[in-house]
Interface confidence: medium
Amino acid sequence: VSPTFQVVNSIAPVQECSTQLDIVIVLDGSNSIYPWDSVTAFLNDLLERMDIGPKQTQVGIVQYGENVTHEFNLNKYSSTEEVLVAAKKIVQRGGRQTMTALGIDTARKEAFTEARGARRGVKKVMVIVTDGESHDNHRLKKVIQDCEDENIQRFSIAILGSYNRGNLSTEKFVEEIKSIASEPTEKHFFNVSDELALVTIVKTLGERIFALEA
C-alpha cells in the first residue's frame, strides 16, 4: 500500500445508482402535510441511495403549496453528502392551497432547464409527492401532456393521511394522482396510508427510478 494511502469516511449509497439521471422532486408543502419530519426522512432515505454528482445523478427539489419555491437546483450540489445535508434543512412552506399543476409545470419549465443544471441528452425524472386534490385541476391534464411531450418520466406518490384522518373518500384523489404518473401506472404510482409510511416505499421507488437507465 502506498504510504500516502488514507482511509476516508464517506457515505456509500445503499444501492449504487451511478447512472446519469436528472431527477426533480416536487414536494407538496401545503398546511395539510403533517408531520413534515416524515417528508424529510423520506427524502433522506431516497437520496442516500443515489450516487450524486455532475457526471452521475443530479437532484433538484421544488416545493409547492399555493406558491412554488426552488429549494435547490439540479447542479447546486455535487455529492450525495451535500444533498443530504441540504434536504434535511428544507422547511415546510405551507399554504392553504395545493397547486399541483403549478408545481409540476414550474418543475418542467424551470427546474429542468440548462440554466438550473439540466444536461442535454440525460433522462429527466420527476417525483411528485402530494397529500390532496389540486386546486388547479383544470391545468393538470395539460401540464402532464407537456411533460409527456418533453419525455419527462413521472413517479407520483399519494399520501392518504389527511383523508384517513378526516374519514374522507380517497377515490377522486387517487385517480388524480394516478393521472400524473407515467405509463404503466402500476410501476409509477404509489400510495401510502400517511406521511410516516413514506419511508416504506423508498426501496421500490429507488429501484424503479434506477431501472430507467438500465
Epitope: L102, H135, D136, N137, H138
Partner: antibody, heavy 120, light 108 residues
Framework: QVQLVQSGAEVKKPGASVKVSCKAS????????LHWVRQAPGQGLEWMGW????????NYAQKFQGRVTMTRDTSISTAYMELSRLRSDDTAVCYC??????????????WGQGTMVTVS | EIVLTQSPDTLSLSPGERATLSCRAS???????LAWYQQKPGQAPRLLIY???SRATGIPDRFSGSGSGTDFTLTISRLEPEDFAVYFC?????????FGGGTKVEIK
C-alpha cells in the same frame, strides 16, 4: 401579427349541428392551447373546453360533454368546434381563444372576432 | 364549480374618476389564476390583468389588480373615455373555468 380569424355567422334549426372554424396566424399554431368560449346575447361568458393543437387532445366542460367536438388541422393552422343537437338556448357568439402558457399560466391573451350562431 | 360574483352590476362615473370593481369567489382561488377582461360592444373581450395583479402587454398602468383568496379588485385610477365598457373577472385554475357576470362601467 398574432391573430385568430373565425368563420362567418351561422343560422341553424333546432336539432342540427354547427361547425365553427378558427384560423391562427402570426405564431406557432401547435405551441398554444386553444379554448372555445361562448356568450349568449347580453349575457356573460361561458367556457366550453380546450384543444391541444399539437396532440389533438381535448378537455370539454361537463355541460357540453357528448355534444361538443373540438378538432384541428395543423397543415392549415385551423381549429374547429362542432356543437350538435342544437337548441334555441345555444344562440350565442362563439369565440376561439389562445391560452398563453409561458408567462400567463393559461390566461386568454388572444381572442378571435367571434362567430354568431343563431338557432331558430 | 367556482362561482364568481361581480359587484356592482353597473358603475356610473365621470372621466377622470377612479373606478373600483369587485370580484368575489365562492371558494378560494389562487392569485396565479385570476384574470380581468374588458369588453366593448360588438367586440371580443381583451385581457387586462392576469395572475390577479400583472398587467397584460400594452395595458396602460392606470389599470391595476389586487386581492387574494376569495376577494379580488380591479382598479382604474383615472377613467379615460375609452375605458367605459364591461369588465369580467375569470378564474382559470379549477375546471370548469368560470367568469363573473360582469360589471358595466358607464358614463355618468
Amino acid at each position: 401579427q398574432v391573430q385568430l380569424v373565425q368563420s362567418g355567422a351561422e343560422v341553424k334549426k333546432p336539432g342540427a349541428s354547427v361547425k365553427v372554424s378558427c384560423k391562427a396566424s402570426g405564431y406557432t399554431f401547435t405551441g398554444y392551447y386553444l379554448h372555445w368560449v361562448r356568450q349568449a346575447p347580453g349575457q356573460g361568458l361561458e367556457w366550453m373546453g380546450w384543444i391541444n393543437p399539437n396532440s389533438g387532445g381535448t378537455n370539454y366542460a361537463q355541460k357540453f360533454q357528448g355534444r361538443v367536438t373540438m378538432t384541428r388541422d395543423t397543415s392549415i393552422s385551423t381549429a374547429y368546434m362542432e356543437l350538435s343537437r342544437l337548441r334555441s338556448d345555444d344562440t350565442a357568439v362563439c369565440y376561439c381563444v389562445r391560452a398563453e402558457d409561458q408567462q400567463l399560466l393559461d390566461a386568454f391573451d388572444i381572442w378571435g372576432q367571434g362567430t354568431m350562431v343563431t338557432v331558430s | 364549480e367556482i362561482v364568481l360574483t361581480q359587484s356592482p352590476d353597473t358603475l356610473s362615473l365621470s372621466p377622470g374618476e377612479r373606478a373600483t370593481l369587485s370580484c368575489r369567489a365562492s371558494q378560494s382561488v389562487s392569485r396565479s389564476y385570476l384574470a380581468w377582461y374588458q369588453q366593448k360592444p360588438g367586440q371580443a373581450p381583451r385581457l387586462l390583468i392576469y395572475g390577479a395583479s400583472s398587467r397584460a402587454t400594452g395595458i396602460p398602468d392606470r389599470f391595476s389588480g389586487s386581492g387574494s383568496g376569495t376577494d379580488f379588485t380591479l382598479t382604474i385610477s383615472r377613467l379615460e373615455p375609452e375605458d367605459f365598457a364591461v369588465y369580467f373577472c375569470q378564474q382559470y385554475g379549477s375546471s370548469p373555468l368560470t367568469f363573473g357576470g360582469g360589471t358595466k362601467v358607464e358614463i355618468k
